[in-house]
């Protein structure tokens, strides 16, 4: 069966949208009005991993681009990236783990939490136009509490 | 503040090898997508290859593409380009750039001659 | 191999605004291709005037903008000074596969 996806975009907390600067630039920043138009929007697939009532395994590609989000051991520390992939074999449903999120709601508040590496987050920076980063700390200085809304097809 | 250092440079023949490095400082080098750059005498800038934050994605220029690898040690704060098989039209300042587009100061670069 | 085309030479009258733009032999340009503008003056490194088709670099006079118009990228400069004469670059990103990023052959502006 064909994974499940959906699309969507997601903003921290602080409702800072995440927009793309560059090819591999992902960065969080305040939008308004017609500059919302500029946030990614992501294509989240329900994929194999441990799953529990509140802990959810997905992957987040960016709608239409052959990039993921990826999580990689980088000179000895766990660091998230944009990876290209083959969009001829992505996305499936037993994604590599590097590719896996435990999406994690809590309070109406969503975490992603790295399945690859357990207790780091998907984070964003308090300071605006700032990479979104993989983080090992919660409920710190930098932001890993997000909102999703949901984008029609 | 933002700051990009680049060395390696220097006078080599055809065929011959150079390590360039990019020490990056004033900014969260672990984070960014960094990019390399070079200017031949007289000519306009050239886009010679960039890197994502882990390594696992690179691009380069078609002009270098099989002779240069680009990588970067964020533990160190590092960015390095490798140039092997060096061409006589490789000879310019590389620049080290934030960002895959290039979007940052630019540093005074380091000049590469490639002459026999 | 796609080449990025800019006007060699322009001109303009202190004060006048002029439009400075970036194409692509084949094809339009669009936000996917994450235009950049360049400033140099001879003997200087180049400066990053806008980024990601219309963000302007720190330090940036609000006097530079970009903006895709039609298929093309766009630098426009408003009230221009007698310091911006210079060479002015744009590159774009070839996500067709090559994944590199290829800057034009630049625009000479004269203020006159």
């Known amino acids: 069966a064909p994974v499940r996806s959906l699309n969507c975009t997601l903003r921290d907390s602080q409702q800072k949208s995440l927009v793309m600067s560059g090819p591999y630039e992902l960065k969080a920043l305040h939008l308004q009005g017609q500059d919302m138009e500029q946030q990614v929007v992501f294509s989240m697939s329900f994929v194999q991993g441990e799953e529990s009532n509140d802990k959810i395994p997905v992957a987040l590609g960016l709608k239409e681009k052959n990039l993921y989000l990826s999580c990689v051991l980088k000179d000895d520390k766990p660091t998230l990236q944009l990876e290209s992939v083959d969009p001829k074999n992505y996305p499936k449903k037993k994604m590599e783990k590097r590719f896996v999120f435990n999406k994690i709601e809590i309070n109406n508040k969503l975490e992603f939490e790295s399945a690859q590496f357990p207790n780091w987050y998907i984070s964003t920076s308090q300071a605006e136009n700032m990479p979104v980063f993989l983080g090992g700390t919660k409920g710190g200085q930098d932001i890993t509490d997000f909102t999703m809304q949901f984008v029609s097809s | 503040e933002v700051q990009l250092l680049e060395s390696g440079g220097g006078l080599v023949q055809p065929g011959g090898s150079l390590r360039l490095s990019c020490a990056a400082s004033?900014?969260?080098?672990?984070?960014?997508?960094m990019s390399w750059v070079r200017q031949a005498p007289g000519k306009g800038p050239e886009w010679v290859s960039g890197?994502?934050?882990?390594?696992?994605?690179?691009g380069y220029a078609d002009s270098v593409k099989g002779r240069f690898t680009i990588s970067r040690d964020n533990s160190k704060n590092t960015l390095y380009l490798q140039m092997n098989s060096l061409r006589p039209e490789d000879t310019a300042v590389y620049y080290c750039a934030k960002d895959w587009m290039a979007t940052t100061p630019w540093g005074q670069g380091t000049q590469v001659t490639v002459s026999s | 191999q796609t080449v990025v085309t800019q006007e060699p030479s322009f001109s303009v009258s202190p004060g006048g605004t002029v439009t400075l733009t970036c194409g692509l032999s084949?094809?339009?340009?669009?936000?996917?291709?994450?235009p950049g503008w360049f400033q140099q003056t001879p003997g200087q490194a180049p400066r990053t005037l806008i980024y990601?088709?219309?963000n302007r670099h720190s330090g940036v006079p609000s006097r530079f903008s970009g903006s895709i118009l039609g298929n093309k990228a766009a630098l426009t400069i408003t009230g221009a000074q007698a310091d911006d004469e210079s060479d002015y670059y744009c590159a774009l990103y070839m996500s067709s596969g090559s994944n590199n990023a290829v800057f034009g052959g630049g625009t000479k502006l004269t203020v006159l």
């Open positions: 084949s094809g339009s340009v669009t936000t996917n291709n994450y």
């Open positions: 004033g900014f969260t080098f672990s984070t960014y997508a």
């Open positions: 890197i994502n934050t882990g390594g696992g994605s690179t």
């Open positions: 990601n088709t219309n």
